[in-house]
């Protein structure tokens, strides 16, 4: 499965002849922390999952999506407080009886080792060391993310 950056690259190549792409905008907005090709923002207040989801939208961002175990570990390394929990963009879909990311994809069972039940009204939080299933109404902090946007450079052929 192609990453969003790879898909973007293919689209650009198809729509614009003689175009190259280089990684760009490697600076996150002020107050955001860069983690690889993402910018992360940690809240300083608490909210249920739905409110957290909505609040990230006000920052033109989304609740954190975690691609794999490696990204989880790198994110957890940014968490300084041992006992604090943060909502991420993953909740239990009752209709599909599976964990579903807010981008519509389902959790690969090998990606995260979730402590707790997979049931209705459950949402996923992370701490410095673990991943938990919590009632979505629980009031905790959250993490927003922005994807760093590739810069597109038009390369003109020699005349």
């Amino acid at each position: 499965q192609k990453s969003s950056i790879e898909k973007c690259s293919v689209d650009i190549q198809q729509s614009r002849n003689k175009t190259t792409e280089r990684p760009g905008l490697l600076n996150c907005p002020i107050y955001w922390q860069q983690l690889r090709e993402k910018c992360l923002l940690f809240s300083h207040t608490v909210n249920p999952w739905n409110n957290s989801l909505a609040d990230c939208s006000t920052k033109e961002s989304s609740l954190l999506l975690i691609r794999d175990k490696d990204e989880l570990i790198h994110t957890q390394n940014l968490i300084r407080d041992k006992a604090i929990l943060f909502w991420i963009g993953l909740n239990f879909s009752l209709s599909e009886k599976n964990w579903k990311w807010i981008n519509g994809s389902f959790l690969n069972s090998n990606d995260l080792e979730i402590r707790g039940d997979a049931k209705e009204n459950s949402c996923i939080s992370i701490s410095q060391t673990s991943v938990y299933s919590e009632y979505c109404s629980t009031e905790i902090r959250w993490i927003c993310q922005k994807e760093l946007t590739p810069v597109r450079n038009k390369v003109y052929p020699d005349s």
Epitope: I30, Y31, L41, F42, S43, H44, T45, V46, N47, P48, N51, D55, K59, R80, D81, I84, E139, I140, R141, C144
Partner: antibody
């Protein structure tokens, strides 16, 4: 303009409880998290905890976790901080302070302070 | 807990002087440092956030700098209304902590 108006001074005996109020005006009360900070006589500032008026969610400094309760009444745009089992070293000025941003920990507006004296 | 140590604790200066107050953190706090001014019997007033960003309405003679573990608040030319106590605060962790304060007095 933004204003946070706190309740008046209190004198309490050791072991008693005190409840301080903070009435907000000039902004959307549910749009900003409220914090409580105290200052003992001649001392520095100590953060006690926060309440999100929108949801009612709280988070307390572990030091006060067993003794503090923060609540709010959105109908009158008022936040409350109750501290129980008072001791003499709880004598301090208690401030409510508005969190300026959901994603940063600074306080942009403060109440005038409520003096709480704990004495037998 | 992250400790913040302010120096000096007391500072005597005259109107027109340039003064610098230092705040040292026991661990790296990035840029998550705030400065407040407090006058006797009053609540603290926000001056600077994120180590160097002046709050709206704060005069330009106040400036902040630093990152990591060492931060400074500078007042370029002291005015009579600037004599007060100044506090730094960190929010790199969710247990917000404050420095012990620097009392700025008239010489």
């Amino acid at each position: 303009q933004v204003q946070l108006v706190q309740s008046g001074a209190e004198v309490k005996k050791p072991g008693a409880s005190v409840k301080v109020s903070c009435k907000a005006s000039g902004y959307s009360f549910t749009g900003y998290t409220m914090n409580w900070v105290r200052q003992a006589p001649g001392q520095g500032l100590e953060w006690m905890g926060l309440i999100n008026p929108s949801s009612g969610g709280t988070y307390y400094n572990q030091k006060f976790k067993d003794r503090v309760t923060m609540t709010r009444d959105t109908s009158i745009s008022t936040a409350y901080m109750e501290l129980s089992r008072l001791r003499s070293d709880d004598t301090a000025v208690y401030y409510c302070a508005r969190l300026g941003d959901n994603y940063r920990g600074y306080f942009d507006y403060w109440g005038q302070g409520t003096t709480v004296t704990v004495s037998s | 807990d992250i400790q913040l140590t302010q120096s000096p604790s007391f500072l005597s200066a005259s109107v027109g002087d340039r003064v610098t107050i230092t705040c040292k953190a026991s661990q790296d706090v990035g840029s998550a440092v705030v400065w407040y001014q407090q006058k006797p019997g009053k609540a603290p007033k926000l001056l600077i956030d994120w180590a160097s960003i002046r709050h709206s309405g704060v005069p330009s003679r106040f400036s902040g700098s630093g990152s990591g573990t060492e931060f400074t608040l500078t007042i370029s030319s002291l005015q009579p209304e600037d004599f007060a106590t100044y506090y730094c605060q960190q929010y790199s962790t969710y247990l917000y902590t404050f420095g012990g304060g620097t009392k700025l007095e008239i010489k």
